[in-house]
């Protein structure tokens, strides 16, 4: 699997999951969460050559096209697989309130 | 959507459907496919500005993020959303076979 | 260079599974389909069946059916047939082979053979 | 299944001579579904002929292939010492693929 496991301890320029930490306030300009200041979002990047962790049969049959049609466009790319929710703390007025936002974490990748 | 309906008929150079057809002997090699000779197989290619057709919470953040970093090279991608089966005959020697071959044809796609 | 290349010898129990890999170069595993071939010692040529890889369609010799599974790794261009149930007729070399192109077709690629003893 | 059936079993010939090893089916493969291999001890089978007729890529023009239906032969024009090895026929008309028992062909 193309996660952290695998893919941080590897030096790897093909579809991978990549570390990234986005501050809130800083990166998104939002003021209304309270905790946490910031989270490992990560995301995924990186070349989809032949067959890398192909999703789909069409995924795998584009992959072979481009292979064997290496001047066309039609490739693959590299996306979120495996996605995790985060739990936030944010005031309504001076309540407050814990919300758990869907899919905000990635964990794998594939080329899709 | 970002479908045929839409994307074959607007000049649209974020992410879209895009055509593409795959003759099965000349561009996979593959000569075990009888019928048909090829297929449209589609492709989604295309530029994933902040929020355009986003598909989770953290592409929508991974979006907002770029725009906020545009250095940043952390940016959705554009790939296929609803996929559809094939419809294939093949012989096993003399005998014809059908099979359907699943997610073979891109029908919308999304920035993921 | 186009090769098919297989995992080493075996010794197993009877009752137990063997599972022999075949890693193909890039070409082979795209377009071709790639079938299984049995030599029990000093016998014949026996073709146990035959799996296209990328869209994991096999076809089995009846005679095998139900003790054998073909399948295809795409992340490594590998093909795999796992025979169980092993019984010691079924000591032999095994071969893997990529067909001219059609699911039952002439083989003209072949691997260097894996040896599975089975023996208690 | 369709058998098919070598003959001979052994076939003694010395260098230089012409050699015809024959190949008959349970059933009509028709005209293209036949192949013949070529085994030396020890190594893996070679493809000589397809389609019951057609010279596989590298394979000398003294190895000829014939026939359709239920009848084949493989014929070798003019033996060299690298030819005496076992032959096999194959059918791929029908599933399960059959293969012939083997002929060895042995220096006289």
């Known amino acids: 699997a193309l996660d952290a496991a695998y893919c941080f301890r590897n030096v790897q320029d093909n579809c991978c999951l990549r570390p990234l930490y986005i501050d809130f306030k800083r990166d998104l300009g939002w003021k209304w969460i309270h905790e946490p200041k910031g989270y490992n979002a990560n995301f995924c990047a990186g070349a989809c050559p032949y067959l890398w962790s192909s999703d789909t049969q069409h995924s795998r049959v584009l992959s072979l096209y481009n292979t064997i049609n290496p001047e066309a466009s039609a490739s693959p790319c590299c996306v979120s697989q495996d996605l995790e929710p985060l739990t936030i703390l944010y005031y309504i007025g001076k309540t407050p309130k814990i919300e758990q936002l869907s899919n905000m974490i990635v964990k794998s990748c594939k080329c899709s | 959507a970002l479908d045929a309906a839409y994307c074959f008929r607007n000049v649209q150079d974020n992410c879209c459907l895009r055509p593409l057809y795959i003759d099965f002997k000349r561009d996979l090699g593959w000569k075990w496919i009888h019928e048909p000779k090829g297929y449209n197989a589609n492709f989604c290619a295309g530029a994933c500005p902040y929020l355009w057709s986003s598909d989770t919470q953290h592409s929508r953040v991974l979006s907002l993020y770029n725009t906020i970093n545009p250095e940043a090279s952390a940016s959705p991608c554009c790939v296929s959303q609803d996929l559809e089966p094939l419809t294939i005959l093949y012989y096993i020697g003399k005998t014809p076979k059908i099979e359907q071959l699943s997610n073979m044809i891109v029908k919308s796609c999304k920035c993921s | 260079e186009v090769q098919l290349v297989q995992s080493a010898a075996e010794v197993k129990k009877p009752g137990a599974s063997v599972k022999v890999s075949c890693k193909t170069s890039g070409y082979i595993f795209i377009s071709n389909v790639i079938s299984w071939v049995q030599q029990a010692p000093g016998a014949g040529l026996e073709w146990m069946g035959g799996v296209i890889p990328i869209v994991d369609i096999a076809n089995y010799a009846q005679r095998f059916k139900g003790r054998v599974t073909l399948t295809a790794d795409t992340s490594t261009n590998t093909v795999y047939m796992e025979l169980s149930n092993l019984r010691t007729e079924d000591t032999a070399v095994y071969y893997c082979a990529s067909t001219l192109g059609l699911v039952l077709d002439a083989m003209d690629y072949w691997g260097q053979g894996t040896l599975v003893t089975v023996s208690s | 299944e369709t058998v098919l059936t070598q003959s001979p079993g052994t076939l003694s010939l010395s260098p230089g001579e012409r050699a015809t090893l024959s190949c008959r089916a349970s059933q009509s493969l028709g005209s293209s579904y036949l192949a013949w291999y070529q085994q030396k001890p020890g190594q893996a089978p070679r493809l000589l002929i397809y389609?019951?007729?057609s010279r596989a890529p590298g394979v000398p023009a003294r190895f000829s292939g014939s026939g359709s239906g239920t009848d084949f032969t493989l014929t070798i024009s003019s033996l060299e010492p690298e030819d005496f090895a076992v032959y096999y026929c194959q059918q791929y008309a029908d599933s399960p693929i059959t293969f012939g028992q083997g002929t060895k062909l042995e220096i006289k």
């Open positions: 389609g019951a007729s």
